[in-house]
């Protein structure tokens, strides 16, 4: 579903990132502490250009854990 | 009260352009997404495109990739849909229709619509 | 591409009766339908989204229902205004499509 050149939109981009994410929740803007001034927030990258796995992560709440 | 005000009828030669604005008034202009959605006579609905008033960014269906253009102008809080090369069967009720969140949850507020005739 | 397919189209009713239209999906799309009412002249209005939330100001004699790819709306207490043309629309990826429509008329 986040392969190169597809685009996530709507509800399958909700759904995604509810998945991506888990437990840990996301934001569709990432926190201002978190983003450049060009960021143009996940509708924009993933919906309107296409994105990637890494890229979706950034819009997760908090840092994954590592093991 | 929250609204969206769309531009008059117009009635257009195979071939021609038509600019269709919708203005919005009562909300935020820059925080919701703006749908433009078709309607043929005695048809159903068609989604065009979305655009993000805030960056002007777009994003079109491809059915009219090449021929759509959507565009906003945040200080009168407008946005416009300018359709070139226009068939006969362009011929339709154009609406503005703001977006609730995320492209997901619908389209809560539609403008009244604009008439776009294309004959010869 | 994602098809919607309404049914049935027309229905004949009247004032008073449970009213059922349905609308499924080609694939599944999770709970992210939305049911708009339309007049004639009219621009579209959203009765409900998510499948089941009632927007606001939207009498509570419509409701919605469903998931994956079978949804339905109901009207409990068919009224006078309520005669109309209601469309199912996808919202769980792009392009955004919409049903046929399925246009309640009176018995």
């Known amino acids: 579903a986040y392969g190169p050149g597809e685009t996530l939109c709507g509800g399958e981009l909700v759904d995604t990132l509810q998945f991506v994410c888990s437990d840990r929740g996301f934001y569709f803007s990432r926190p201002s502490s978190r983003a450049n001034r060009r960021s143009r927030g996940i509708v924009e990258e993933c919906c309107f250009r296409s994105c990637d796995l890494a890229l979706l992560e950034t819009y997760c709440a908090t840092p994954a854990k590592s093991e | 009260q929250v609204q969206l005000v769309q531009s008059g009828a117009e009635v257009k030669k195979p071939g021609a352009s038509v600019k269709v604005s919708c203005k919005a008034s009562g909300y935020t202009f820059t925080s919701y997404y703006m749908h433009w959605v078709r309607q043929a006579p005695g048809q159903g609905l068609e989604w065009m495109g979305i655009?993000?008033?805030?960056?002007?960014?777009?994003s079109y269906a491809q059915k009219f990739q090449g021929r759509v253009t959507m565009t906003r102008d945040t200080s009168t809080s407008t946005v416009y849909m300018e359709l070139s090369r226009l068939r006969s069967d362009d011929t339709a009720v154009y609406y503005c229709?703001?977006?609730?969140?995320?492209?997901?949850?619908?389209?809560?507020?539609w403008g009244q619509g604009t008439t776009v005739t294309v004959s010869s | 591409r994602i098809q919607m397919t309404q049914s049935p189209s027309p229905l004949s009713a009247s004032v008073g009766d449970r009213v059922t239209i349905t609308c499924r999906a080609s694939q599944s799309i999770s709970s992210y339908l939305n049911w708009y009412q339309q007049k004639p002249g009219k621009a579209p209005k959203l009765l409900i989204y998510?499948?089941?939330s009632l927007q606001s100001g939207v009498p509570s004699r419509f409701s919605g229902s469903g998931s994956g790819t079978d949804f339905t709306l109901t009207i409990s207490s068919l009224q006078p205004e309520d005669f109309a043309t209601y469309y199912c629309q996808q919202s769980y990826s792009t392009p955004l499509t919409f049903g046929g429509g399925t246009k309640v008329e009176i018995k």
């Open positions: 998510a499948a089941s």
């Open positions: 655009i993000n008033p805030s960056g002007g960014s777009t």
């Open positions: 229709a703001r977006d609730v969140q995320w492209l997901a949850y619908g389209m809560d507020v």
